[in-house]
């Protein structure tokens, strides 16, 4: 309705004789701002005077008047949207309606707001979930309907009167919709909390009681129970009996129904709070429980071990490992089913009995083939001495031994020749099934155990054999000691360390890797002609004309090896050097000639130098000279000279005559 | 110091004679350590030799085939100068032409002094 | 006629770089292999003759080297002056041919 001031704030707020009020509070004048406000405590309207009537807690008005009581009360609002208010201390006559008359320029309202103030603090409200079973985390809310800036207060939990370890978390509210003042506490509760009282205690500041609320909880779970057997110590032998009962220490709702368990396997037809075992059996040893069940679930006691004691049983050997590998660790153990555990144990190989060895387990730390065969064992505790079982085997494996490589061949094997080898051995577990043979090649096994070498190599020096079952045992290699014509045979320059030049004296050495048997000869020879016998071969003055193809050749008692032919370089300067004249040393003025310095050189001339007949060197530096066109007075000797990186050489002069040609004649 | 001064017309008709002049100080002509030789340059031939005239025991001359038979070199004793002339010009022989100093003794013929050159334009 | 090849026709480089350029002969000239340095609008001027003898006057960052067919001028470190074209010459025989050039510009 448009013709009316809007205004917010909680309907009705509640305190306690000497604490406080803060009215949260927000509104709308119909038009401009608020020129005159007055709270009435229980105002009523006269009709007469066209005014309220009542007590007037505070006042403020144009003129600025207050009455005294405005210490106590205090509007903290303004004029156009604030009209919070605020009585500190408050008292119970405050209790009542309180009336907000306002008033701007042309319009009135008044407001009303109900208070409640009680002589005592009152107390605050517990709020429990419908439902708490245990273990599940619930939150209790404990909630007061109070709230003041000037008036600190503060809420605490308790379980049967002591302060609960859980923190709470608190929270106020002083907002138009609700003033409160709220504590929540996140709780786990368990069985036994079942029937115990939770306060919510409200304190001042100080920590001074004030008032409280309290609650009974109603913790739903799983029946809890308690397992008693007879005898106490759940130990009999074969044929005794045992009487197991089943007590219920608490449960919420009521129990439902009863079972009892062995091995976590339901018993049939046991359905009471007693269970009867008559003549036991070893097999009804186990772990016993009872379970009882209600609408939350079934509740489990405690596990009752149920041990039923017998003489042992026959005997099993388990062998760690078979079949086992010479040298190896084996252990042996004797498994009999016994209650007790067996005390005494003995062992048998091979239907002897193997003295000292009392134990469960016999370890032998290094097996060798002669503990290969049966073994079995007895156990023994109070009640008796069990029966013999059947035993275990042990097979003890190892290589083949004394493994030797045989040459069939007559001696001396020469290269190329045929060699057939076998490789033996003394005995194997398990059997041999293959041989290897070092080192590998394209060779023939005719048969297993046996090796054919066609061709025989050089270099094949010694052969070892291995047979192999699960393992290979190798043999000693033995030495073929192939004989062969000589290897590898190469001219090398001893001298000079450098490249060859004309003069130098020149050393070649035969060189070869090797010869067997030891004892050699040499040859040397150039373009098929035969120089020396020796290993070298020696030039006092090397000459140009020593350069060429060498070989030499090594020999012995199986045959003869030729080098590589070694190319033998003489390095030399510039020699025979001599002009040649193109067309010819006679040219006619006006024509071309072409000068050409030819020579013999080891390395190539790099450059040439040309010279005149008054010995000035002219401006060319490669092998042909061009004069064009030719002058009568380039008539003429000339001389060249060549040089290279092992010296400089000149050539003999070459005269060149230059004639008139007919125009020439004709002038003159 | 050596010098060379170039003299000569920067433009020449085609099909007329080009003249150029190479005055040396500091230098012989006819020094038997020397050569004198005549360079182009245009940007699309690079630099070209040309030729050159020296004197050893005689007067020699060497051209560049590309103007063999329409080039001439002479060397002029008595004025210490060398001159170029080459016949029948066309407008591919607008260059930039340098006379040069060859040095033949420890500099092995490298042109060690230039001349300032001369732009010449062939054109009608 | 005796082809020189110079690479590369080109480069970019800076103040302190080395450089290298590089000249190959179309047949052997033994050591008779000069390198010039030309700016514009001058003549060119003698750095390195005979392939690594330096020209008198010419500053000691210029070096040359080869011999036969493949020669190589270096700057080891690079001065503002030297941005210029470089060019190769051979004095072996005639007729005298130079290379195409290599001009080094500012990075």
């Known amino acids: 309705d448009s013709s009316k001031w809007v205004f917010e704030h909680p309907e009705t707020l509640y305190a306690w004789e000497g604490a406080c009020v803060w009215i949260p509070c927000t509104y709308r004048a119909l038009d401009g701002d608020l020129e005159s406000f007055i709270l009435f405590h229980n105002p009523e309207y006269n009709k007469n005077t066209s005014k309220f009537d009542g007590t007037r807690l505070y006042e403020s008005t144009k003129d600025g008047k207050v009455p005294s009581e405005q210490k106590r009360v205090q509007f903290l609002g303004d004029k156009n949207k604030n009209c919070t208010l605020s009585i500190h201390p408050v008292h119970l006559n405050d209790s009542g309606q309180l009336g907000l008359r306002m008033e701007s320029k042309t319009e009135k309202w008044m407001e009303r707001i109900h208070l409640n103030v009680s002589e005592r603090p009152f107390p605050p409200h517990i709020q429990l979930p419908p439902e708490i079973q245990e273990s599940q985390e619930v939150t209790l809310t404990c909630l007061l309907n109070f709230s003041c800036y000037g008036y600190p207060i503060q809420l605490q939990w308790l379980l049967e009167g002591v302060p609960m370890r859980q923190a709470a978390v608190t929270s106020t509210s002083l907002t138009i919709k609700s003033v409160f003042t709220r504590s929540e506490l996140k709780f786990s509760p368990q069985w036994s909390h079942h029937g115990k009282i939770v306060t919510c205690q409200l304190q001042d500041a100080d920590g001074k009681f004030l008032s409280n609320d309290t609650v009974q909880l109603n913790v739903k779970h799983t029946p809890k129970l308690e397992i008693k057997v007879t005898p106490s110590d759940a130990i009999v032998r074969e044929g005794d009996s045992v009487t197991m009962t089943c007590e219920v220490s608490s449960s919420n709702p009521e129990y439902t129904t009863v079972s009892w368990l062995k091995d976590g396997t339901s018993l049939k037809k046991q359905n009471t709070f007693t269970l009867n075992l008559r003549e036991v059996t070893k097999d009804q040893s186990g772990k016993y429980c009872c379970q009882v069940s209600n609408d939350v679930g079934p509740g489990r006691s405690e596990e009752v071990f149920l041990q039923v004691q017998y003489a042992p049983e026959p005997s099993t050997v388990q062998i760690l490992h078979s079949p086992a590998v010479e040298g190896s660790q084996v252990e042996f153990l004797c498994m009999s089913l016994a209650n007790p555990l067996p005390t005494n144990y003995t062992w048998y190989h091979n239907g002897k009995e193997m003295q000292g060895r009392t134990e469960e387990k016999v370890h032998i730390p290094k097996i060798l083939p002669w503990h290969a065969g049966t073994y079995s064992c007895v156990a023994e505790n109070i009640l008796g001495t069990g029966q013999r079982g059947p035993g275990a085997e042990l097979d003890v494996q190892y290589p083949p031994k004394k493994v030797t490589t045989v040459i069939q061949n007559p001696m001396p094997i020469r290269e190329g020749d045929t060699v057939t080898l076998s490789c033996n051995y003394n005995s194997s577990n398990p059997s041999v099934t293959r041989y290897e043979w070092k080192p590998h090649g394209a060779w023939e096994e005719p048969s297993l155990g046996v090796l054919k070498i066609q061709n025989v190599g050089w270099d094949n020096t010694t052969i070892a054999c291995a047979a192999c079952n699960s393992w290979c045992s190798w043999a000693s290699p033995v030495a073929l000691n192939v004989q062969y014509a000589p290897r590898d045979v190469r001219v090398r320059k001893i001298k000079p360390l450098s490249e060859i030049h004309s003069g130098n004296s020149v050393s070649l050495q035969c060189d070869f890797s090797s010869s067997h048997p030891k004892e050699v000869q040499f040859f040397w020879e150039k373009n098929g002609r035969l120089l020396g016998k020796e290993s070298q071969l020696n030039f006092d003055s090397i000459s140009p004309e020593d350069a060429g193809s060498y070989s030499c050749w090594v020999n012995n008692s199986i045959g003869q090896t030729a080098s590589k032919a070694w190319t033998l370089e003489v390095l030399y300067a510039p020699r025979r050097l001599r002009v040649s004249m193109s067309p010819g040393d006679q040219v006619m003025e006006g024509k071309s000639a072409t000068l050409t310095c030819e020579s013999d050189a080891n390395p190539p001339v790099s450059h040439y130098t040309w010279f005149d007949w008054n010995n000035q060197s002219l401006p060319y530096h490669s092998q042909k000279l061009r004069l064009e066109p030719v002058k009568v007075q380039h008539s003429g000797a000339y001389w060249c000279q060549g040089t290279n990186s092992v010296g400089k050489g000149r050539s003999p002069l070459s005269t060149l005559t230059v004639y008139y040609s007919p125009e020439t004649i004709g002038r003159r | 110091q050596v010098q060379l001064q170039q003299s000569g017309p920067g433009l020449v008709k085609p099909s007329q004679t080009l003249s150029l002049t190479c005055a040396i100080s500091g230098d012989s002509v006819s020094g038997n350590r020397a050569t004198w030789n005549w360079i182009r340059q245009s940007p699309s031939r690079g630099l070209e030799w040309l030729g050159r005239t020296y004197y050893r025991s005689a007067w020699y001359n060497d051209y560049a085939v590309s103007v063999k038979g329409r080039i001439t070199f002479n060397p002029d004793t008595s004025k210490n100068q060398f001159s170029l002339q080459l016949n029948s010009v066309t407008p591919e022989d607008t260059a930039v032409y340098y006379c040069?100093?060859?040095?033949?003794?420890?500099?092995?013929?490298?042109?060690?002094?230039w001349g300032q050159g001369t732009t010449v334009t062939v054109s009608g | 006629d005796i082809q020189l090849t110079q690479s590369p026709p080109s480069l970019s480089a800076s103040v302190g770089d080395r450089v290298t350029i590089t000249c190959r002969a179309s047949q052997s000239i033994s050591s008779y292999l000069n390198w010039y340095q030309q700016k514009p609008g001058k003549a060119p001027k003698l750095l390195i003759y005979a392939a690594s003898s330096l020209q008198s006057g010419v500053p000691s960052r210029f070096s040359g080297s080869g011999f036969g067919t493949d020669f190589t001028l270096t700057i080891s470190s690079l001065q503002p002056e030297d941005f210029a074209t470089y060019y190769c010459q051979q004095s072996y025989s005639t007729p005298q041919t130079f290379g195409q050039g290599t001009k080094v510009d500012i990075k």
């Open positions: 040069a100093r060859g040095e033949s003794g420890a500099a092995a013929d490298a042109f060690d002094i």
